[in-house]
């Protein structure tokens, strides 16, 4: 058989799911895993950033934290901004569940969301703009 | 409040249509705290492939292209949500899982603790 046939269990051993849908348990595995936020790398970085919390009651999780680079350039050894270098955002995709209200009915949709995680300092690409 | 179990549409909506995925593809090389990307693959997870960043150096790259140990390269980590097949191997039954990934690296002023 094909790779897919051998990989998946026989349908009877899996929960029945309506066509075009998937069953999703939103009780999170590893819920208590935490990033060490005490490191303060966002303020110690040569490309520092700030955090903004976005909140949406129809999204799970309702809170998503986004980073924004503080400067266009990078901070040099003297603590001054060096605009010969660039602060740029580093981004990562994550999944969220979106609740949609259509009249009296409610449906759920998975969404890919791009989160800015932090910033890094890069050598600029020369665009030769006059 | 969200119910514990929901039925969701198989099509995953992508809200990132206004971003160019190639835009940041070379930051790993141009950064003063460059990193390598390592493929982490798990067929029981969606997405099945996640790229993990590993900082290349202990220090940061200075203007001369040398490693400067007065500064430290550190990973930027993020918790993300992925789907885990539950029960295992089932094509359309999942549970949300939180995983910690290193997305890239940044150059920081050191907190001198144990390095002379």
């Amino acid at each position: 058989g094909s790779e897919g046939e051998t990989f998946f269990q026989k349908p009877e051993s899996c929960p029945p799911v309506p066509g075009g849908s998937m069953k999703l348990d939103i009780g999170i595995i590893n819920e208590n895993q935490r990033v060490s936020m005490s490191r303060n790398i966002e303020s110690r970085s040569t490309s520092p950033w700030d955090y903004t919390v976005t909140w949406d009651p129809n999204r799970y999780p309702s809170e998503v934290v986004q980073a924004q680079c503080r400067n266009l350039g990078c901070i040099n050894a003297q603590g001054k901004e060096d605009i010969s270098m660039n602060s740029v955002p580093i981004q990562q995709e994550t999944l969220v569940v979106r609740r949609k209200h259509q009249g009296s009915s409610v449906s759920f949709q998975l969404e890919k969301v791009l989160v800015t995680v932090g910033c890094t300092c890069v050598t600029p690409v020369i665009h030769h703009v006059q | 409040n969200f119910p514990r179990t929901v039925m969701v549409n198989l099509n995953i909506h992508n809200r990132n249509t206004n971003t160019n995925p190639k835009r940041s593809s070379d930051y790993y090389d141009r950064s003063t705290s460059p990193w390598n990307l390592h493929r982490n693959e798990d067929p029981e997870r969606y997405p099945s492939v996640i790229w993990e960043a590993k900082c290349r150096h202990l220090g940061c790259i200075n203007a001369d292209g040398n490693v400067d140990y007065h500064m430290n390269s550190v990973p930027i980590q993020q918790e993300i949500l992925v789907l885990r097949r539950e029960p295992p191997h089932c094509p359309n039954s999942f549970r949300l899982e939180k995983i910690l990934v290193s997305v890239g690296c940044t150059c920081v002023t050191p907190i001198v603790h144990h390095v002379a």
């Epitope: 060490s36 490191r39 790398i41 | 990193w35 390598n36 390592h38 982490n40 993990e52 960043a53 590993k54 900082c55 290349r56 150096h57 202990l58 220090g59 490693v67 140990y69 430290n72 390269s73 550190v74 990973p75 980590q77 990934v101 290193s102 920081v108 050191p110 907190i111 603790h113 144990h114 390095v115």
Partner: nanobody, 123 residues
Framework: QVQLVESGGDLVQAGGSLRLSCAAS????????MGWFRQAPGKEREFVAA????????KYTDSVKGRFTMSRDNAKKQVYLEMNSLKPEDTAVYYC????????????????WGQGTQVTVSS
Amino acid sequence: QVQLVESGGDLVQAGGSLRLSCAASGLTGSSYAMGWFRQAPGKEREFVAAISWISGDTKYTDSVKGRFTMSRDNAKKQVYLEMNSLKPEDTAVYYCNDMPYGLDTRMDEYVYWGQGTQVTVSS
């Protein structure tokens, strides 16, 4: 769970040499640096050396510079510490560990340590 097994420690005369080995397993996908540390009797554990898995660049504490050399074998997931011109003050239990934040890793962030390997330098 990270597992660390250090070996190679011994009793040696001042001026002698030793090579310590450390086998690491269970490292996370983002692990990018390893370190050697030591703890002398009645003293706090201190940093000795660090190495990047990718570039192989190294950093040493001042007291061992020019005498100790750290290296790694990526395929075996092992790191080594070549110790030359040993001095009595190098006497300690030597430990290796993953450095999840590289040189930025604080001592209080380590959860797990291996058994270590005893190095004794007699005068």
